[in-house]
Amino acid sequence: DGCKDIFMKNEILSASQPFAFNCTFPPITSGEVSVTWYKNSSKIPVSKIIQSRIHQDETWILFLPMEWGDSGVYQCVIKGRDSCHRIHVNLTVFEKHWCDTSIGGLPNLSDEYKQILHLGKDDSLTCHLHFPKSCVLGPIKWYKDCNEIKGERFTVLETRLLVSNVSAEDRGNYACQAILTHSGKQYEVLNGITVSITERAGYGGSVPKIIYPKNHSIEVQLGTTLIVDCNVTDTKDNTNLRCWRVNNTLVDDYYDESKRIREGVETHVSFREHNLYTVNITFLEVKMEDYGLPFMCHAGVSTAYIILQLPAPDFR
């Protein structure tokens, strides 16, 4: 059928609560494309009727809620004018008690389930809630060992739990809970997080190391498409954010309307002592305004930039 197959990492999810997955694969989904979701190689697309428990919502597949029998491989097919990509996502559903955060023994747990706080620092935990715009999320409550978290050291800020002056006693099993509203119905979302405490700050020192770029310029023709990787090494237990910024603004926010320049999905390769992270920036079409502007890759406190430059004229 001419579609290129792309395999995503496994997602491990809780039964009896909402779940959503967005079919984005920059730069494929940046232009004019159609996205269709299928389950287990079925020829019949996932329903787009919003009353259906499982339905497609724009580029998302939405489960309201996820059920035990929903485990399997889902495909989203992205069709552009001249291309077709089929993204395969393996979803594994498991039963989980309301306050149960220790889900050891499950393979390839995402970092959303395992987070790090840094001893003696002000730090934070993140409640990862990825849902389409049609889902409205209420305020988040945080629990530790099944009990609500309280105290002047803890502050809930949007999707984060801020912890001031982290102590060794802050390790343990946490859960964040939110009420999701969709089409007038309410659902509870509960994410478990196993938290460990570290004194170490970074790979080979106190900061993440940006391998590429190296504060340099790149020659690129006007109107072309350009993809630049930012490669970062960091400790396995780091909590650093990696992103691309321009004019001190996230590129996805800066180019929110045109979506001409986008940040890619972060990937990483695990080594024994550290992780190698890659997050790219895609210029769908380089414009004059892009030249001379530093596009910054950030990784924790580390930064490195690229500057686009017009190629020197060829007088041959």
């Epitope: 008690h97 002047e152 006693e169 099993n173």
Partner: antibody, heavy 116, light 107 residues
Framework: QVQLVQSGAEVKKPGASVKVSCKVS????????MNWVNQAPGQGLEWMGM????????RLAQKFKGRVTMTVDKSTSTVYMELSSLRSEDTAVYYC?????????WGQGTLVTVSS | DIQMTQSPSSLSASVGDRVTITCRAS??????LNWYQQKPGKAPKRLIY???SLDPGVPSRFSGSRSGTDFTLTISSLQPEDFATYYC?????????FGQGTKVEIK
Amino acid sequence: QVQLVQSGAEVKKPGASVKVSCKVSGYFFTSYWMNWVNQAPGQGLEWMGMIHPYDSETRLAQKFKGRVTMTVDKSTSTVYMELSSLRSEDTAVYYCASSTTAFAYWGQGTLVTVSS
Amino acid sequence: DIQMTQSPSSLSASVGDRVTITCRASQDIGNALNWYQQKPGKAPKRLIYATSSLDPGVPSRFSGSRSGTDFTLTISSLQPEDFATYYCLQYASSPYTFGQGTKVEIK
């Protein structure tokens, strides 16, 4: 390091009250729940209830509602458990146990003897 | 309330033996279960947190596992200092409840 130091042994008459203290050091006192557990001689462990030092929210086991009062003194990082209308079957060792992570640290215990 | 049924109530074993103690929860408690060791005249000491996480300083011969609502504490090779009483505790929802205890004695 973390320490929970309880008050000394008490001998009380039936009908009287006893107030046991638990002084905390080594962690942020107002960040975590504190539990109280008792153990009658030769018997098992029994959860009585818990209090959060931040706002004094208390949760009690049904058996102890009306007879147990838990309080907090933030200035001294101390939690108190008062048991009233004592009877002979209240003779037990009373422990405080912190929920920094669930029931991680325990006091050394306070023996309360109820005898006429 | 959640009931915790612990078995056996006592057992006799020799140094080097493999010992297994079980707690059954009357309803789903996820992994919210601890194991404690108590010696006469002393406060309980936590061995295992959240079903299977070994507390710092606890010998690796102690391990915890779960199958549904059945929880197991295993001592792979009993040592002289392990003769004591062991309790499980569920903290999934209050009122929190302990198992009745298992006394491990020298054969």
